[in-house]
């Protein structure tokens, strides 16, 4: 968090060392909605710091967070979902820093899954399909997937393409024939929810086959 | 106490442009964007656009993209919006405004009245 | 752009007695039980002043007399009982979707 101080608070240059992040998933367990935050400086020492939220809640003005190692968790049902929460680091009950956050907009989906790749082989291409729990929720339902994929060789040269839908086709022409190739997924909120990416799916090895010219046949 | 206050009140010339300002007081200016909002007897209420103070990040109602420019100030804790060629139409009064969540407006400012005449 | 239909355009009532203004979107404004639908008070020569947030979250220093309710299209702000002192235009804005937009208001006189 970056800016001025102003009528009193802390400057929050003298707070750097306990600069944290947050991520929230909304119905992550049924109708719990959840917040991860954690430190940026991972050596900083955790011992007696907690967090707290206040603001932007449904029949409590506060709640702590439970520690997991290294990271402050809190599952509940509370979040209003509009305004802004203010997040405070506490020691001993005094805020060390705090920042103001609409949950809405720190929002992390969940990891698409079941993801595979078909051969088509009339059709000269490959259907790409995977799927999200995000379809069954009823906050964030609208998503913006990043599928990359790339030949395995190729260690850092990866492939990317959005799209809204579960499903993706990729011409075997635009692909190199006789190669292995590893592909994977992952999603953003889109319509009204912000946020972060998702994490990865797990990904994908598909094998591309050889260029099969039968007589009479032009190569594409 | 959380208080928005705008510049005064302006005579315009069509063609000219003009800048209002808005200083805040009374809470941390980087947690809360600030929004512009015209009013005028015939249209009502009109967003013209906001600005994020902690990143300088801008979004606008696409009927004032060019017409108004918003930036801010960290230093006074003061945002400003810039109006361009101004014409008769943009004669009204100009609210900022503090967004206490997405995108409802908590605290007003106390308006600025700018009138383009020729 | 979601257009606000308020309604009716100005009311009178007693005082001590119920007022009830209407807010139509003409798309909804609701995601699930999220309703970005939000009403304003505003006195001759003052600037707008938030009364419902979400729907039916009264502002902090708002009396308890206003309350909001409604959901996707409709939206509706009750003042009971009516005071002397709630004689303004009331308006309804959404927030779902650039451009956010504001209904034409409602006046209301005090009898």
């Known amino acids: 968090e970056s800016g001025y101080a102003q009528n009193g608070d802390l400057e929050d240059a003298e707070l750097d060392d306990y600069s944290f992040s947050c991520y929230s998933q909304l119905e992550v367990n049924g109708s719990q909605h959840s917040l991860t935050c954690a430190f940026e400086d991972p050596d900083v020492n955790t011992t007696n710091l907690e967090f707290e939220i206040c603001g932007a809640l449904v029949e409590v003005k506060c709640l702590s967070f439970r520690k997991l190692q290294e990271i402050y968790f809190i599952e509940t049902k509370k979040f209003l979902l509009i305004g802004k929460s203010n997040i405070c680091v506490k020691v001993g009950g005094k805020s060390l820093t705090c920042k103001k956050i609409d949950l809405t907009t720190i929002v992390k989906p969940e990891a698409p899954f079941d993801l595979s790749v078909i051969y088509r082989e009339g059709a000269n291409d490959f259907v790409v399909t995977f799927n999200t729990s995000h379809l069954q929720k009823k906050y964030v339902k609208v998503l913006m997937h990043d599928v990359a994929y790339r030949q395995e060789k190729d260690e850092n040269k990866w492939m990317h393409v959005n799209l809204s839908s579960t499903k993706l086709t990729l011409l075997q022409r635009n692909l190199q024939p006789e190669a292995m190739y590893e592909i994977k997924v992952r999603s953003i909120p889109d319509h009204y929810f912000k946020g972060f990416w998702s994490e990865w799916s797990p990904s994908y090895y598909f094998r591309t086959p050889e260029i099969n010219n039968s007589p009479g046949e032009m190569d594409p | 106490q959380v208080q928005l206050q705008q510049s005064g009140a302006e005579l315009m010339r069509p063609g000219a442009s003009v800048t209002l300002s808005c200083k805040t007081s009374?809470?941390?200016?980087?947690?809360?964007?600030l929004h512009w909002v015209k009013q005028t007897p015939v249209r009502g209420l009109e967003w013209i656009g906001g600005i994020d103070p902690k990143t300088g990040g801008t979004a606008y109602n696409q009927k004032f993209k060019g017409k108004a420019i918003l930036t801010s100030d960290r230093s006074s804790s003061t945002t400003y919006m810039e109006l361009r060629s101004l014409a008769s139409e943009d004669s009204a009064v100009y609210y900022c405004?503090?967004?206490?969540?997405?995108?409802?407006?908590?605290?007003w400012g106390t308006g600025t009245t700018v009138t383009v005449s020729s | 752009d979601i257009v606000l239909t308020q309604s009716p355009a100005s009311l009178a009532v007693s005082l001590g007695q119920r007022a009830t203004i209407s807010c139509r979107t003409s798309e909804s404004v609701s995601i699930h039980l999220l309703h970005l639908m939000h009403w304003y008070q505003q006195k001759p020569g003052q600037p707008p002043k938030l009364l419902i947030y979400g729907a039916s979250n009264l502002e902090s220093g708002v009396p308890a007399r206003f309350s909001g309710s409604g959901s996707e299209t409709d939206f509706t702000l009750n003042i009971h009982p009516v005071e002397e002192e709630d004689a303004a235009t009331y308006f309804c804005?959404?927030?779902?979707?650039?451009?956010?937009?504001f209904g034409g208001g409602t006046k209301l006189e005090i009898k």
């Open positions: 405004t503090r967004s206490g969540g997405r995108w409802y407006f908590d605290v």
């Open positions: 009374g809470y941390r200016f980087t947690d809360y964007e």
């Open positions: 804005q959404q927030s779902i979707k650039d451009p956010y937009t």
